[in-house]
Amino acid sequence: FERTRSLQDPCSNCPAGTFCDNNRNQICSPCPPNSFSSAGGQRTCDICRQCKGVFRTRKECSSTSNAECDCTPGFHCLGAGCSMCEQDCKQGQELTKKGCKDCCFGTFNDQKRGICRPWTNCSLDGKSVLVNGTKERDVVCGPSPADLSPGASSVTPPAPAREPGHSPQ
């Protein structure tokens, strides 16, 4: 089948990094500067992504692969292929419509992105607070008095964090 296809379509022989040039009798021509083709048999090359403004070049464009971008310091990537950059906040803050704001009492954020999450409620598990929470750190739950027997585990790790999103304004 491959041999039949290539007899019918000379373009199928053009490798990645080239395009099938209709203006030159369908011969394989190299992709022009600032363009690429990542698969064989293409009739055009795609324009390379330009990482400018808040975007930085993480990987240069080549004749066979597109450029890859990340974000300038103080920002982080969002979306498929880093299609957007969102500003970082400090630990203990979350990004709102009014910019970076401190976590309210009883909530924390230990990252530079995402939302402030409520401290773990130790009493729900029958535990006591071993280490108080802060804006940057969750509480650490310790044993309840009944657990203080030899061989009992002394510290329970906090509950896993919820998926980041944005709390209502």
Epitope: L78, G79, S83, M84, C85, K97, H166
Partner: nanobody, 123 residues
Framework: EVQLVESGGGLVQPGGSLRLSCAAS????????MTWFRQAPGKGLEWVAH????????YYVDSVEGRFTISRDNANNSLYLQMNSLRAEDTAVYYC????????????????WGQGTTVTVSS
Amino acid sequence: EVQLVESGGGLVQPGGSLRLSCAASGFTFSSYWMTWFRQAPGKGLEWVAHIKEDGSEKYYVDSVEGRFTISRDNANNSLYLQMNSLRAEDTAVYYCARGGDGYSDSHYGVDVWGQGTTVTVSS
């Protein structure tokens, strides 16, 4: 080509005023939140203000609230930043940026950025 071009920067004395403009082209301007950022010499980028697609919501960083006003003219694909009572600490390169899809609903990511215009506040 999607493009943002800022203008209006310059040298101004403390207490003075400037109006920055941002001309947008290559996309449907009225469909996007728009944002101003700034970068002071030797410092990181700082968010200044942003404005909803129809201009009905505007938000400012605390340090410029009451002194700066963000506005837009969707008919002319233009974004503005009116800066009054300027201070030395407002000295920076000012950039306009386009909010990405879903801006303010699920994130505050930007995807298109201008080249910047320089504001210097000095006596």
